[in-house]
């Protein structure tokens, strides 16, 4: 072990203050006591240390807490959080939502870094489930957070937390994720009346089964084409022309522009051409009149 340079006379830090920004690397190492730093972490953020000076301070904390920092220190890390590696963060036990908020604030405006992802993972695992307050906090900082979770992770989201979800939070979700979220949303919003219910449930409909879409078609909801295009193909296929017409209301005219895209293309192929003609949109590709349609899947189920 190389002998450390001694702190020059009169330079020993009595408190964490602005004067330390003029301390050289070796002076910070020699003159700032790690225990003092830990108790005055809240002051570090107010001092415009450079990244190299923050590196020195981090080394000090690492030596003081080799098993991981206590939450009292973590909560006040501020900019020093940007120095932490995912390996550092895995040693932490973060239980307070205030701590989580304080650290997310430091990273605000940036993409979710591996450090932040690790922090959130540690926090959620510590809580056992993704409760409403946590979800509120996470989606406020990272609108795409929900869609970054696996279907398995989403299964721990209680229905009550769904109230915190905004439409933009689901923009990048795939069908597997919406399959998990939709039943929770349906449960969460079940006591709302028709039009209010539809406004809330709309963003989750990419996970809705056929029977729910049929029920919605009876409620004059006027679903827009963007929502319709995100529906599960297997849920749309069994819908009749009349049901789709009721579901879309005045937006039904938009089907023409989407006739080559799923799920509209596949749905058209399953409809009788004369039924499609009743829409007056010029949709082509339906089953010609006089053809018999056998539902083989039904036959298989019976045999």
């Amino acid at each position: 072990e190389v002998e450390k340079t001694a702190c020059p006379s009169g330079k020993k830090a009595r408190e964490i203050d602005e004067s330390l920004i003029f301390y050289k690397k070796w002076e910070l190492e020699a003159c700032v006591d790690a225990a003092l730093l830990a108790t005055q972490m809240d002051r570090v953020n107010a001092i415009p240390f450079t990244y190299e000076q923050l590196d020195v301070l981090k080394h000090k904390l690492d030596e003081l807490y080799p098993q991981g920092y206590p939450e009292s220190v973590i909560q006040h890390l501020g900019y020093l959080f940007l120095k932490m590696s995912p390996e550092d963060i895995r040693k932490w036990n973060v239980t307070s939502l205030e701590t989580l908020k304080a650290l997310l604030e430091v990273n605000k405006g940036h993409e979710m870094s591996p450090q932040v992802a690790t922090l959130i993972d540690r926090f959620v695992k510590g809580r056992g489930q993704l409760d409403k307050d946590t979800l509120d906090t996470l989606t406020a900082f990272y609108p795409g957070y929900l869609c970054s979770l696996s279907p398995e992770e989403l299964s721990s989201v209680p229905p009550s937390s769904i109230w915190a979800v905004r439409p933009q939070d689901l923009d990048t979700c795939d069908p597997r994720q919406l399959d998990v979220l939709y039943p929770k949303a349906r449960l969460a919003f079940q006591n709302m009346n028709g039009s209010e219910y539809f406004v809330k449930i709309q963003s989750f409909l990419g996970g809705a089964p056929t029977e729910d879409l049929k029920a919605l078609s009876q409620q004059n909801v006027s679903m827009d084409l963007a929502t319709f295009m995100k529906l599960r193909t297997d849920a749309v296929l069994p819908l009749t022309v009349a049901e789709v017409q009721k579901l879309l209301g005045p937006h039904v005219e938009g089907l023409k522009a989407e006739e080559r895209h799923r799920p509209v293309r596949d749905w058209i192929l399953r409809q009788r051409q004369d039924d499609l003609d009743t829409l007056g949109l010029g949709l082509q590709g339906g089953i010609p009149n006089g053809y018999l349609v056998l539902d083989l899947s039904m036959q298989e189920a019976l045999s």
């Epitope: 190389v2 340079t5 003029f22 450079t50 990244y51 405006g109």
Partner: antibody, heavy 117, light 107 residues
Framework: EVQLQQSGADLVKPGASVKLSCIVS????????MHWVKQRPEQGLEWIGS????????KYDPKFQVKATITADTSSNTAYLQLSSLTSEDTAVYYC??????????WGQGTTLTVSS | DIVMTQSQKFMSTSVGDRVSITCKAS??????VAWYQQKPGQSPKALIY???NRHTGVPDRFTGSGSGTDFTLTISNVQSEDLADYFC?????????VGGGTKLEIK
């Protein structure tokens, strides 16, 4: 007086590797950070990366992560920059610089590297 | 990554004049900015550190100001030996980044 003495100019062939050195006098490199900076003819400065010799911890600009390796030998008080798979794009003057934690207070005289067949 | 922008590539001034060179950071870098001077054929030299502190031996006609995202290097009473390139550099976070430089020409 602090001095950073860099190795002499080098002419190397494309595809080869080169190791530039920066010998430091009048201070202990473990008490500082050592940086490397690239400057191509008539162009600005580009930070390549740095090393904390006391903790043997190097950091790089992602752009140079594959190209450059920064090391330090505390016994000889020397910092090194190794550049691999050289191309004409690597033709430049390379500077080492010392930082006490907040700016580059001393610079080497620069090493001119020419990559040509 | 933080981008440092020096919008003036060239500036022309006369001996005795006062000139201000600006540098803008793409995000808040607090006061962790340094200014460097590079004369033709020489290595860069430090002028200002932590936005407003003069490096040892730098004449007091060089002053630095600013914090956050906007920084200025001011040279009052410009001398002929000030003909050089001037660079700002942020020391706030990795990777360090340097402004494109401003070449000061003396009329």
């Amino acid at each position: 007086e602090v001095q950073l003495q860099q190795s002499g100019a080098d002419l190397v062939k494309p595809g080869a590797s080169v190791k530039l050195s920066c010998i430091v006098s009048a201070f202990n490199i473990e008490d500082t950070y050592m940086h490397w900076v690239k400057q191509r003819p008539e162009q600005g400065l580009e930070w390549i990366g740095s090393i904390d010799p006391a903790h043997d911890n190097a950091k790089y600009d992602p752009k140079f992560q594959v190209k450059a390796t920064i090391t330090a030998d505390t016994s000889s008080n020397t910092a090194y920059l190794q550049l691999s798979s050289l191309t004409s794009e690597d033709t430049a003057v390379y500077y080492c610089a010392k930082s006490d934690g907040f700016y580059f207070d001393s610079w080497g005289q620069g090493t001119t590297l020419t990559v040509s067949s | 990554d933080i981008v440092m922008t020096q919008s003036q590539k060239f500036m022309s001034t006369s001996v005795g004049d006062r000139v201000s060179i600006t540098c803008k950071a793409s995000q808040n870098v607090r006061s962790a900015v340094a200014w460097y001077q590079q004369k033709p054929g020489q290595s860069p030299k430090a002028l200002i550190y932590l936005a407003s502190n003069r490096h040892t031996g730098v004449p007091d006609r060089f002053t630095g100001s600013g914090s956050g995202t906007d920084f200025t290097l001011t040279i009052s009473n410009v001398q002929s030996e000030d003909l050089a390139d001037y660079f700002c550099l942020q020391h706030w976070n990795y990777p360090l980044s340097v402004g494109g430089g401003t070449k000061l020409e003396i009329k």
